[in-house]
């Protein structure tokens, strides 16, 4: 068989959850490998996943360095087997990703509600604070850690016999909420944060409602 | 020029650290993963690990880890391979290496380490 | 890890035979190099992913190979060729050399 020419990393795209973090390319090689390099923009370029037979590569510990960074990545194409390179004087073909911003861009995880806890006519609702891959002193921060105040949760709360939805804002990870006695109600959650231009909501978490086991019901 | 330069020969005795040196020039120090690798006598090739020196991250050969240390100083472009307690068994050649793709390979013209009581 | 063996670990040929030497991995590999090393000198990549000669490198020499098994090959031995070579590979870490093979003359 004849010889086959490297092609060029296509279609680079950010896979960004929790600031979990994933570089993911086209083409699936073909007697090619590929190594990604990672910067910021003022920044060396720095090798990860070497010459892998992968289309994607894991930079979390890359940009959890400093989230608020703008980074870059380039995917080179090496030949491995039967091929030519066909970069210019022996220099390998790369293509540019798109520019990440983790703490804009990231998307917001399903958040979980923790627990509720019904006390007379009030509901506290409270929303797990989830553990995201940055770091500080040596621990990993929460959502809220890295967020702050930017990072609102927006809960939706209707009574199990009707349809019609209420919903309540926090900037904290918990609500207290009216409700009338003796109804039960079902409760649901979204991480917003309202500064965003992309990327601004989270999925809805899985519904809870009063009367399962994460509640607690007390009579004052 | 891109070249590595390593520190000279040393003869130690069982027991005894040895911190011995690679200065690169004629690049950007920074920027490129620095390989360590020993060679015992009339043996072959054994990749110790790697460095970034930006940041410091390390790739180490587990059969290495508790026998040598791998770090940089930035400030004057040196890597540094470190025992703290030498055996016998590491008497060996020792050679940097800068990690490049292809026809680019530069390497430093190795250390002699003899531990010898 | 994935081991490398080299065979044979030794050869003796003369000016103008083919040689083949042959390396065999433990477990798939999809980039391997080779290097030339020459009695107190540092080594030199040679053959870089498979089959890609490094700069300076001859074109009597080639390289070839996919999944566990690759070759280096010297189509008609010179005398600056008589060296010990070394596969290696950089598919997984630890990245791991074969045990070399040493090209004598005859």
């Known amino acids: 068989s004849g010889t086959t020419n490297t092609v060029a990393a296509y279609n680079l795209t950010w896979k960004s959850t929790n600031f979990k973090t994933i570089l993911e390319w086209e083409p699936k090689p073909v007697n090619q490998v590929y190594t990604v390099q990672i910067s910021t923009k003022s920044g060396d370029w720095k090798s990860k996943c070497f010459y892998t037979t992968d289309t994607e590569c894991d930079l979390t510990d890359e940009i959890v360095k400093d989230v608020k960074q703008t980074y870059l990545a380039r995917v080179f194409s090496y030949p491995a087997g039967n091929v030519e390179s066909t970069g210019s004087a022996g220099e390998p073909l790369y293509e540019n990703s798109p520019e990440f911003t983790p703490y804009l861009e990231t998307n917001l995880g399903q958040p979980t509600i923790q627990s509720f806890e019904q006390v007379g006519t009030k509901v506290n609702v409270t929303v797990e604070d989830e553990r995201t891959l940055v770091r500080r002193n040596n621990t990993f921060l929460s959502l809220r850690d890295v967020f702050g105040k930017d990072l609102i949760y927006t809960l939706y709360y209707w009574k199990s016999s009707s349809s019609g939805k209420k919903t309540a804002k926090t900037n904290t990870n918990e609500f207290l909420i009216d409700v009338d006695k003796g109804e039960n109600y079902c409760f649901s959650v979204q991480a917003v944060i309202p500064s965003r231009t992309v990327n601004r909501k989270s999925t809805d978490s899985p519904v809870e409602c009063m009367g399962q086991e994460k509640g607690e019901f007390r009579e004052i | 020029e891109v070249q590595l330069v390593q520190s000279g020969a040393e003869v130690k005795k069982p027991g005894e650290s040895l911190k011995i040196s690679c200065k690169g020039s004629?690049?950007?120090?920074?920027?490129?993963?620095m390989n360590w690798v020993r060679q015992m006598p009339g043996k072959g090739l054994e990749w110790m690990g790697m460095?970034?020196?930006?940041?410091?991250?390390?790739r180490l050969n587990q059969k290495f880890k508790d026998q040598a240390t791998l770090s940089v100083d930035k400030s004057i472009s040196t890597a540094y391979l470190q025992w703290s307690s030498l055996k016998a068994s590491d008497t060996a050649m020792y050679y940097c290496?800068?990690?490049?793709?292809?026809?680019?390979?530069?390497w430093g013209q190795g250390t002699t380490v003899t531990v010898s009581s | 890890d994935i081991q490398l063996t080299q065979s044979p670990s030794s050869l003796s040929a003369s000016v103008g035979d083919r040689v083949t030497i042959t390396c065999s991995a433990s477990s798939s590999v999809s980039y391997m190099n080779w290097y030339q090393q020459k009695p107190g000198k540092s080594p030199k990549i040679w053959i870089y992913g498979i089959s890609n000669l490094a700069s300076g490198v001859p074109s009597r020499f080639s390289g070839s190979g996919s999944g566990t098994d690759f070759t280096l090959t010297i189509s008609s031995l010179q005398p600056e060729d008589f060296a010990t070579y070394y596969c290696?590979?950089?598919?997984?870490?630890?990245?791991?050399f074969g045990g070399g093979t040493k090209v004598e003359i005859k």
């Open positions: 290496a800068r990690e490049d793709y292809g026809s680019s390979d530069y």
């Open positions: 290696q590979q950089k598919s997984s870490f630890p990245w791991t």
């Open positions: 004629g690049y950007s120090f920074t920027s490129y993963w």
């Open positions: 460095i970034y020196p930006a940041d410091s991250e390390t």
